[in-house]
Interface confidence: low
């Protein structure tokens, strides 16, 4: 829907991956003076929340406290601003933000081939595996906002595995992976133990964009 005002911004603090029972703050903000903010969730359980806007230094914002985190609070969130209350005149929606609950299932294992310490320019692949029959694996890197997502391969030696080819190593970092099931895209496993990948040589600040690998599926947006 077009909206009478431009879209506000929606951020998650401390991040969009939220452990079960923990709380996330979804901050909706705009430089338009909105008196009201509405936060709408799509997912298994739809909902809409309303807060009065706060105004500081030309910025309007509302902090929505979501938690303690449970499955029915996970989903795709969008926020709207409104300058009036009766009737509401909604802005265009913010960009969608997927909030994922983690810590629900057994943690997968994460390993690096040929190993966690590689020479600059050398190819490195991260493998995420589990005895649990996860349909999807998600790889996150500390400090990055998005995750890579790969389908799990067929069962081999009692485990389901996905390989994340990071390509020629240019920059180290701490990686974690999670497993999830196809019918519950917002519900993820416990995090794997963190894996520190070290690159010897000249590092640069890049790692494959989550939209680059052709084998990867897109981030979930809607269940319905």
């Amino acid at each position: 829907h077009e909206g009478v005002h431009r879209k506000p911004s929606l951020l998650a603090h401390p991040g969009r991956l939220v452990k079960s029972e923990e709380t996330v703050i979804l901050q909706c903000w705009s430089d338009v003076r909105f008196e009201h903010f509405l936060l709408h969730r799509e997912g298994k359980f739809k909902d809409t929340l309303h807060l009065i806007g706060e105004h500081h230094d030309g910025v309007s914002k509302a902090n929505f406290s979501i938690g303690p985190m449970m499955q029915d609070l996970a989903g795709t969130y969008r926020c709207y601003g409104s300058v009036t209350h009766s009737p509401y005149q909604l802005s265009a929606p913010s960009d969608p933000l997927d909030i994922v609950i983690t810590g629900l299932y057994e943690k997968p294992s994460l390993s690096a081939q040929p190993g966690p310490t590689v020479l600059a320019g050398e190819s490195v692949t991260l493998s995420c595996s589990s005895r649990s029959s996860y349909d999807m694996y998600h790889l996150s890197r500390e400090g990055e906002a998005h995750e890579c997502r790969f389908s799990a391969g067929p069962k081999v030696n009692g485990t389901f595995q996905a390989d994340f080819p990071l390509g020629p190593a240019t920059h180290g970092g701490t990686y974690r992976c999670f497993g999830s099931f196809r019918d519950s895209p917002y519900e993820w496993s416990n995090s794997s133990d963190p894996l520190l990948v070290s690159v010897t040589g000249n590092p640069s600040n890049s790692w494959p964009s989550p939209t680059e690998p052709s084998s990867k599926t897109g981030n979930p947006r809607h269940l319905h």
Partner: antibody
Framework: EVQLVQSGAEVKKPGSSVKVSCKAS????????ISWVRQAPGQGLELMGG????????NYAQKFQGRVTITADESTSTAYMELSSLRSEDTAVYYC???????????????WGQGTLVTVSS | EIVLTQSPGTLSLSPGQRATLSCRAS???????LAWYQQKPGQAPRLLIY???GRATGIPDRFSGSGSGTDFTLTISRLEPEDFAVYYC?????????FGGGTKVDIK
Amino acid sequence: EVQLVQSGAEVKKPGSSVKVSCKASGGTFSSYAISWVRQAPGQGLELMGGIIPIFGTANYAQKFQGRVTITADESTSTAYMELSSLRSEDTAVYYCATSGGYSYFLSPLDYWGQGTLVTVSS
Amino acid sequence: EIVLTQSPGTLSLSPGQRATLSCRASQSVSSNYLAWYQQKPGQAPRLLIYGASGRATGIPDRFSGSGSGTDFTLTISRLEPEDFAVYYCQQYGSSPLTFGGGTKVDIK
């Protein structure tokens, strides 16, 4: 001030369905979150679900999922709650309620309808 | 879901006395989003208190709410004849919204 007026009492047979209406006045109906709460005789209050007309999405309590359908008609400022596969334990007073604005939660229920008694008996 | 347990189930008091009603949550109530309602026979519930301690419009100041986290209290400082009713607490900070089982305040 928001006012909610509900349809009259109903007597239904087990296995049938009932549809209760809730007409709102005194505000912007499309922005109300209309919740439905039921109360069995001598018992407490139980949330069934709710709807926000402007978003058109209903939210149902797990216990009622699959049996309850909540809808809204913006042209008549009326919300509806339909409960199917009725059994004797569904005998209760059914209330619609609202905070007078958006929100299934993060708002208390300020305004209530007068209640509709649904009796399920063979 | 958050389970709310109210106590006592029944409180027998005389007009003029002080009533203290308790509501305990199975887990912390987000932002103290807890409400209290009064319900008289044959009537719909009426909102008394929101946000654990805020009085709703038109509610006399003999009604007060307090508490945070998992323990909440509704106090009626001096019972009037019209205060004899059933009182429910409700949390509205987490989905699904839930109600306590109620406390009946009756005349001794």
